[in-house]
């Protein structure tokens, strides 16, 4: 259209600008390795570099990576954006404890209310439930609508605090009292948890639970499901089994749905400290000084905590196998069995004495 | 390090308003599951619950008392505040505030040193 | 309201002696019960929430058990600074109720 050529003419003899017909502008040519962020520039800061798929632009005029929310925690919140990163958030009955850029480093399962209290605010991706005493005349089973939804004739199973799976409230401010955190580097190295947290290391609902119909009231023949890797716990809890993961442990016994899969070290390792279901630690087994034998018995299944020696001596060696029989065992404390990276305390019943490792989730 | 400390007139007459504060640090009270209550104890009785404010402004109070309660919060200022109706010399006690910091138990894990309040014509 | 008693006022008891305080609740509370120790002309301090867990810094010398209406705090190995009231507190219900304290003399 002859009528065009004047606006058309205005970009020849500028080689920082070219004519597009479509919008019938002029318009500000990117430079090599940048590309237009809408279809005629108009000026340099209308250009930006183009990064690769799963990579925005940052402030700093960075390519860098979107975070990603492939674990089975985390799902996506908002996409990957050519000058935003992928944010990820806990999954729906998950709130995050530690919260990492534009993602969640710990997910929780939201607590359950102890057994006669009420939600007061039920978790999100980023709380914790809370919970309130019941208001006199008021049901505790129906006091709220997160907890009575539509009426049925059992009650909805509800949590003892239990120092099964590590949860966090996010009123965490600790009183100087004796605030106890675990440092997460510290935390495979305890042998003793502290005694009780204020608000961190709360009991969660059942993780792993399938949605499934609470059994009526009576009604012993009916049992939840869990999902794989849980195993229903004595206290009808459902609780992830310990993983042997670990390059020094071996599968003993399978996850099973009322009982967690057991970890022992691996052939010509020795437990050195037990955990439940599992160890702690595998040491390499004990070379016997001269003249002594090894009693015969399989060390791995040995789940006393070891303690090292005097010096010069070897542990479990007999100058004769006299007998076959393995020295007298004491069962292990109750262990508690913590993901190393947890950086919370937990709460133990004051009624019994509790280890804490950092073998297996 | 988590403080609490009360304030209050110390002496009043019956009939009269009684308006109590208690400032606090080391913690917010915008965060989820916080809160703050009031309970008194007069001399050589028993502890008795007044009111709770939770993070997000809700108030539960003591039915026996609770049409002369009123509790309220100034998150940024870090203070709550507690105001009693038409007192009279049953009243009279030392007020604590404590903070509820769990957000699963209702345990009130620290308090203020408290203030004594009498009610004495 | 829930009435949370402690029958016992006051108790007597040695250093390195062990010594249980009970409180007994009017109704079902389950585990929604909490201990305070107060020392003479000092504020309540939480030694134990949910019956039986114990506050962070709390000597593990204080154990609590009970549930449903019948509660008990043990203190075992008593030491002089445990020289104090105790009171044990519902949170089952609105409103909040204490028991009425039990006094803890050392011989």
């Known amino acids: 259209f002859p009528q065009d050529r004047p606006f058309e003419d205005t970009c020849h003899g500028n080689p920082s600008h070219y004519y597009d017909k479509a919008v019938r502008r002029c318009c500000y040519r990117c430079p090599m390795g940048l590309f237009p962020t809408q279809q005629c520039p108009q000026r340099p800061t209308d250009c930006r570099k183009q990064c690769e798929p799963d990579y925005y632009l940052d402030e700093a005029d960075r390519c860098t990576a979107c975070v990603t929310c492939s674990r089975d925690d985390l799902v996506e919140k908002t996409p990957c954006a050519w000058n935003s990163s992928r944010v990820c958030e806990c999954r729906p009955g998950m709130f995050c404890s530690t919260s990492a850029v534009n993602s969640c480093a710990r997910c929780f399962f939201h607590s359950v209310c102890p057994a006669g209290m009420i939600v007061k605010f039920p978790g999100t991706a980023q709380k914790n439930t809370v919970c309130e005493p019941a208001s006199p005349g008021v049901s505790p089973a129906c006091a709220s609508p997160e907890n009575c939804k539509e009426p049925s004739s059992g009650t909805i199973p509800q949590a003892k605090p239990t120092p099964v799976s590590p949860a966090t409230s996010s009123a965490s401010t600790m009183p100087v009292r004796g605030g106890t955190r675990l440092a997460q580097e510290a935390a495979s190295k305890l042998t003793r948890a502290p005694d009780s947290p204020s608000s961190v290391g709360r009991p969660s609902s059942d993780p792993g639970l399938s949605p499934t119909q609470p059994c009526p009231e009576g009604s012993g023949d009916c049992r939840k499901q869990c999902e794989p890797d849980y195993y229903l716990d004595e206290a009808g809890r459902c609780t992830a089994c310990v993983s042997c993961s670990r390059d020094d442990l071996v599968e003993k016994t399978p996850c099973a749905w009322n009982s967690s899969r057991t970890c022992e070290c691996r052939p010509g390792m020795i437990c050195a400290t037990s955990a439940t279901n599992s160890c702690a630690r595998c040491v390499p087994y004990p070379i016997c000084a001269a003249e002594t034998v090894t009693k015969p018995q399989d060390m791995a299944e040995k789940d006393t905590t070891f303690e090292a020696p005097p010096l010069g001596t070897q542990p479990d060696c007999n100058p004769t196998p006299e007998n076959g029989e393995a020295p007298a065992s004491t069962s292990p404390t109750q262990s508690l069995l913590v993901d190393s990276q947890a950086s919370k305390t937990l709460p133990i019943p004051t009624s019994a004495p509790v280890a804490l490792s950092s073998t297996g989730k | 390090q988590v403080t609490l400390k009360e304030s209050g007139p110390g002496i009043l007459q019956p009939s009269q308003t009684l308006s109590l504060t208690c400032s606090f640090s080391?913690?917010?009270?915008?965060?989820?599951?916080?809160?703050v209550s009031w309970i008194r104890q007069p001399s050589g009785k028993d502890l008795e619950w007044l009111a709770h404010?939770?993070?997000?402004?809700?108030?539960r109070y003591n039915p026996s008392l609770k049409s002369r309660l009123t509790i309220s919060k100034d998150t940024s200022s870090n203070q709550v505040f507690l105001k009693i109706t038409s007192v009279d010399t049953a009243d009279t006690a030392t007020y604590y505030c404590?903070?509820?910091?769990?957000?699963?138990?209702?345990?009130?894990?620290?308090w203020g040193a408290g203030t004594t309040v009498t009610v004495s014509s | 309201d829930i009435v949370m008693t402690q029958s016992q006022k006051f108790m007597s008891t040695s250093v390195g002696d062990r010594v249980s305080v009970t409180c007994k609740a009017s109704?079902?509370?389950?585990?929604?019960v909490a201990w305070y120790q107060q020392k003479p002309g000092q504020s309540p301090e939480a030694l134990i929430y949910?019956?039986?867990y114990r506050y962070s810094g709390v000597p593990d010398r204080f154990t609590g058990s009970g549930s449903g209406t019948d509660f008990t705090l043990t203190i075992s190995n008593v030491q002089s600074e445990d020289l104090a009231e105790y009171f044990c507190?519902?949170?089952?219900?609105?409103?909040?109720?204490f028991g009425s304290g039990t006094k803890l003399e050392i011989k």
């Open positions: 404590a903070r509820r910091a769990d957000g699963l138990y209702f345990y009130l894990d620290v």
């Open positions: 080391g913690f917010s009270l915008s965060t989820s599951g916080m809160g």
């Open positions: 404010i939770y993070w997000d402004d809700d108030k």
């Open positions: 109704q079902n509370v389950n585990t929604n």
């Open positions: 949910s019956a039986s």
């Open positions: 507190q519902q949170y089952n219900s609105y409103p909040l109720t």
